[in-house]
Structure formats: structure tokens, C-alpha cells
């Protein structure tokens, strides 16, 4: 069945049941997501506007899908498996009496079950499992997923990674020669290479050992920290910088007015909320955008996405992926892919990795 092809998932509560205080609804839904994030690498965040991956809806009767609710009792809720549009959305029957306790129907317990479906789980035949098809109240203070639930969800997403990269907590300058150093984004700018990390960037002038660290805000005061992707079109003296669902255009090292703009103007579908990495190849005049385990190819001349995308990174970039942090183009034949503290020199003509390096190998570490 389908799964989310990313680990950062957004949800939005479209409307609130009058049966409960709003804060109690927020809390029940947040705790229900937490049940699943505790046993997987998934991270959930609530958004209040815009398109979320998972929309939580309270509705009665016919409500916009084929599966009309049936009044009090019977079907309590339903949820759609991962995907765009209605995919992932969880619908709760407003004709039930939703509660924080054992009376009526407990929202938290029902939400844990429905979010299981939103993440791609089917029903379980184990009566102790939260994914068992019938509702049964259990003490929410001592609630635990069953071994079957955990096995099911970890078969889809794996277990929580202890070594997951966390953002630099105090935003202090990262140690350049730390062997675990990773970058948020990397791009060439003329004969220089910019390496972005948190609120800093390092500037490396090609073939020279010296590098300097700078605050992004010192060069471009209007830009945010935490740039996530970047690419250069050298012939136009343009650099594109990405964060979340926005991008900025830098021309001749100066930010253009009327930016940021939405990444969706490139033609990404709505479910794309951020770009992991991007690189422009002047030979083909195409930009490659990497999003989770997929990539899109954009025709810079025609200003539109090439048909047939997205494609899987692992399928078309042998040895790279499934996900990357950063990439840049150099020496007319190489992409340098960054994955955590590792870097791969990739010959795009031979279509293979030609060298494996540490991410900070450019700094003479």
C-alpha cells in the first residue's frame, strides 16, 4: 500500500467539534500523532493555514467523499491512506459525541486508529491492537501501542533513528572540521562555492585552500537563515535560494525585489512543501529539484517542468539517495551530492559515483 515518501508531515484541523473545547481537540490530535512519532522517524507539525498533508475534519452525513457517515454509532470515522489531495485525510463523524474520557467516543483513541490509516496501516486481526477494526475504550493514561501496531508501522517507516540530525540548538557557528558536519545547501556562485548551514555560509574560492565563514544576514539581510536548497545559472548571473515553500532570486549577488515567491510557480504539485536540493546543468539547460526520494527536472528555457517527473532518485542516480541534503555542479561533468556527513562525486556522463568524500573535504580538513 501507499506510504508517505517523507518524514516531515503536516496536519491541519479544518474545523472543531462543538462536543469538546478546542484546546482539548488540539491536545487529543497532537497526542495521537505523537503515539506514532514515538515509534517511527516521522515528525508531525500542525499548520493553521494552507494545504496540509493530513486534513482532520469533523463532518456528518455526506461530506465530500463517497463514504457518507451514518449518524450516531456505526462508523465513527474514516481516513484515507497516504497520497495527495484527499490522501491522508481523517474524517470524524460529527454525529458521535466526542470526549476526552470514557463517556461517548474518545477522540484520542479514535484518532490514533485513524492516523494509523493516514500513515498507510490497514486493520489488524489482533484484538489488543489499536488498528483492530472495532472501537473499545482503554485507559488513555496507560495507553500503549501493541507489538502488532509497532511492527506494522515500523515495517513502513522503520524505527526512530537515534542519530537523526537535529538543527544546531544555539545557532552557534558549526565546527568546520567536525567529521559529522553536514550542509543544508551548496551552490557555485561564479568561481566560488557557497556552503549553507543554519544561519551561516562558508565561502570557498575554487582551488584555494582558504575559506571564510559569514552570516547569511550580513550578505543578504532580507533572506532567512536555514536555506534548504540553492542553484546557480551562471550565464544569467542568477542564484536561486529555497526555504520551505518559498524561493528568492539573487542577481549579480543582489536580492531581486518582489521575492520570495512560491515554489509552486515552478509547477510543483501542492504536496511539495519544500525542496531538499537543486542543481542546474548548463549542458542540458535543465534544473534538477530533489524532494524526499524523488526528483523533478525543470526546463529553464521553456520555464516549465519536463513531462514524466517526478522520478526516483535511486533509479536514475546510481548509488545516490534515497534522499539528499545538497548538490552542486562543477567541472562540466560532475554533480557533488551531499548526504549527511558524506559527499559523492558523481559523473553525470558516465552516470556513476567516481569518488566518496567527507562533506567538508573542500576545506582541507
Amino acid at each position: 500500500g501507499p506510504v508517505w515518501r517523507k518524514h516531515y508531515i503536516t496536519y491541519r484541523i479544518n474545523n472543531y467539534t462543538p462536543d469538546m473545547n478546542r484546546e482539548d481537540v488540539d491536545y487529543a490530535i497532537r497526542k495521537a500523532f505523537q503515539v506514532w512519532s514515538n515509534v517511527t522517524p516521522l515528525k508531525f507539525s500542525k499548520i493553521n493555514t494552507g494545504m496540509a498533508d493530513i486534513l482532520v475534519v469533523f463532518a456528518r452525513g455526506a461530506h465530500g467523499d463517497f463514504h457518507a457517515f451514518d449518524g450516531k454509532g456505526g462508523i465513527l470515522a474514516h481516513a484515507f491512506g497516504p497520497g495527495s489531495g484527499i490522501g491522508g485525510d481523517a474524517h470524524f463523524d460529527e454525529d458521535e459525541f466526542w470526549t476526552t474520557h470514557s463517556g461517548g467516543t474518545n477522540l484520542f483513541l479514535t484518532a490514533v486508529h485513524e492516523i494509523g490509516h493516514s500513515l498507510g496501516l490497514g486493520h489488524s486481526s489482533d484484538p489488543k491492537a489499536v488498528m483492530f477494526p472495532t472501537y473499545k475504550y482503554v485507559d488513555i493514561n496507560t495507553f500503549r501501542l501493541s507489538a502488532d501496531d509497532i511492527r506494522g508501522i515500523q515495517s513502513l517507516y522503520g524505527d526512530p533513528k537515534e542519530n537523526q540530525r537535529l538543527p544546531n540548538p544555539d545557532n552557534s557557528e558549526p565546527a568546520l572540521c567536525d567529521p559529522n558536519l553536514s550542509f543544508d545547501a551548496v551552490t557555485t556562485v561564479g568561481n566560488k562555492i557557497f556552503f549553507f548551514k543554519d544561519r551561516f555560509f562558508w565561502l570557498k574560492v575554487s582551488e584555494r585552500p582558504k575559506t571564510s565563514v559569514n552570516l547569511i544576514s550580513s550578505l543578504w539581510p532580507t533572506l532567512p537563515s536555514g536555506i534548504e536548497a540553492a542553484y546557480e545559472i551562471e550565464a544569467r548571473n542568477q542564484v536561486f535560494l529555497f526555504k520551505d515553500d518559498k524561493y528568492w532570486l539573487i542577481s549579480n549577488l543582489r536580492p531581486e525585489p518582489n521575492y520570495p515567491k512560491s515554489i509552486h510557480s515552478f509547477g510543483f504539485p501542492n504536496f511539495v512543501k519544500k525542496i531538499d536540493a537543486a542543481v542546474f546543468n548548463p549542458r542540458f539547460y535543465r534544473t534538477y529539484f530533489f524532494v524526499d526520494n524523488q526528483y523533478w527536472r525543470y526546463d529553464e528555457r521553456r520555464q516549465m517542468m519536463d513531462p514524466g517527473y517526478p522520478k526516483l532518485i535511486t533509479k536514475n542516480f546510481q548509488g545516490i539517495g534515497p534522499k539528499i541534503d545538497a548538490v552542486f555542479y562543477s567541472k562540466n561533468k560532475y554533480y557533488y551530492f551531499f548526504q549527511g556527513s558524506n559527499q559523492f562525486e558523481y559523473d553525470f556522463l558516465l552516470q556513476r559515483i567516481t569518488k566518496t568524500l567527507k562533506s567538508n573535504s573542500w576545506f582541507g580538513c
Epitope: 475534519v57 467523499d65 491512506g81
Partner: antibody, heavy 122, light 103 residues
Framework: EVQLLESGGGLVQPGGSLRLSCAAS????????MHWVRQAPGKGLEWVSG????????FYADSVKGRFTISRDNSKNTLYLQMNSLRAEDTAVYYC???????????????WGRGTLVTVSS | DIQMTQSPSSLSASVGDRVTITCRAN??????LNWYQQKPGKAPELLIY???SLQSGVPSRFSGSGSGTDFTLTISSLQPEDFATYYC?????FGQGTKLEIK
């Protein structure tokens, strides 16, 4: 390449029966909801019926409820529509359409067949 | 029951024009609205799903917007191949269709 090919249409008298088939290829048929949508000559689109992946869950438009039966044979990658007690107003091109989802139907039809014409006339 | 009202029912326009078609639901359908294009004698084709997501392979001159009860399909610059009939749809309910003709 996804292909849906309808067959079984033709001329039938009011009160008569007809069975439409839709042969699916180019995708794994069994996990997806499938639907029939019709279009009377010169008119708009009208959803007729839908069926879940295993065939256990079916939905019908009020206009055909009790007269039409949707079914599927996953081993043959084929969708069916059995039409009984046909009326003049059932005259239409009948399209088979693939839903984008399994488990619950989203009602989002990403692939359609070319249609088969059913004419109900005496 | 949910009903969809599409307007206008027909529309004349010229190549290069910007065209907007609207669809209204009688109750909230969130963003569960799709748009299809149908050319004479052909099956419908999916253009936009979930109100604003462009189906793969559809030109970027097509865009959709809206949520709740009011939705629009916009063609930013009409091309000769865009003259067709457009339908909005939500689950088992289609709008009446908008026939887009050459002026």
C-alpha cells in the same frame, strides 16, 4: 501504459438487459476502486456506480439503484456493469474509470476508457 | 445532498485570452474538487485535482483555486487545443459543464 477498454454496448429494447465489460491493463487492477460514468448524447457527465478493491463495497447513483449491478473479477482484470430494466433515459456512452485510490474511494478518476454506446429504444 | 453548480454553461473566447470557470458547492467540500477537460468524441481527461494540484503532463497555463464551497479553473492564455468542455467534479457529482468555444 494504462488502458481501459469497454465493450458490450449496443441497441436494446426498453425493459431489456445488457452487460458491459471493461478490460484493464497497464496497472495492477486489484488494489483500486473502479467506476462507471455515463454521458447521454449532448449532455454532461453522470456518475453511475463504483466498486471497492475486493468487490465487497459498492455504490450506485439513485437513478440506477436496484436496476444496475457493478462487479469485478480481479483475476481477469475486468470490471462489469449488469444493466436490467433498461429505460430510454439510460441511453448514453458508458465510460469505465479508474479511481486514484484504494481502501476508500476518493472519487478522483485518473484514467478513463473510450466508452461504449448503449442505446435503449424500441 | 451535495450539489455542484458550474458557471457559465458556455463561453466564447479568443486564443490568448485569460478564462475563468467557477464551480460552487452547496456545502463545504474542503479541497475535494477536481476538474476535467473533454473534447468531442473523446473521454474526459483529468486536469486539476484537490482544487489546485496540476495533473502530471497538464500545461501550466491551467490552474485551480478555492476551498470550502467556491472553486475556479483558470486558463491563463488560451491555446487552440483548449477549446473543449470543462467539468468540475466531487466524488459522484459532476457540474453541468462549461463549453468553451472560439469567438
Amino acid at each position: 501504459e494504462v488502458q481501459l477498454l469497454e465493450s458490450g454496448g449496443g441497441l436494446v429494447q426498453p425493459g431489456g438487459s445488457l452487460r458491459l465489460s471493461c478490460a484493464a491493463s497497464g496497472f495492477t487492477f486489484s488494489p483500486y476502486w473502479m467506476h462507471w460514468v455515463r454521458q447521454a448524447p449532448g449532455k454532461g457527465l453522470e456518475w453511475v456506480s463504483g466498486i471497492g478493491p475486493s468487490g465487497g463495497l459498492t455504490f450506485y447513483a439513485d437513478s440506477v439503484k436496484g436496476r444496475f449491478t457493478i462487479s469485478r473479477d480481479n483475476s481477469k482484470n475486468t470490471l462489469y456493469l449488469q444493466m436490467n430494466s433498461l429505460r430510454a433515459e439510460d441511453t448514453a456512452v458508458y465510460y469505465c474509470a479508474k479511481d486514484i485510490r484504494g481502501a476508500y474511494s476518493s472519487g478522483l478518476f485518473d484514467y478513463w476508457g473510450r466508452g461504449t454506446l448503449v442505446t435503449v429504444s424500441s | 445532498d451535495i450539489q455542484m453548480t458550474q458557471s457559465p454553461s458556455s463561453l466564447s473566447a479568443s486564443v490568448g485570452d485569460r478564462v475563468t470557470i467557477t464551480c460552487r458547492a452547496n456545502q463545504s467540500i474542503y479541497t475535494y474538487l477536481n476538474w476535467y477537460q473533454q473534447k468531442p468524441g473523446k473521454a474526459p481527461e483529468l486536469l486539476i485535482y484537490a482544487a489546485s494540484s496540476l495533473q502530471s503532463g497538464v500545461p501550466s497555463r491551467f490552474s485551480g483555486s478555492g476551498s470550502g464551497t467556491d472553486f475556479t479553473l483558470t486558463i491563463s492564455s488560451l491555446q487552440p487545443e483548449d477549446f473543449a468542455t470543462y467539468y468540475c467534479q466531487q466524488a459522484g457529482i459532476f457540474g453541468q459543464g462549461t463549453k468553451l468555444e472560439i469567438k
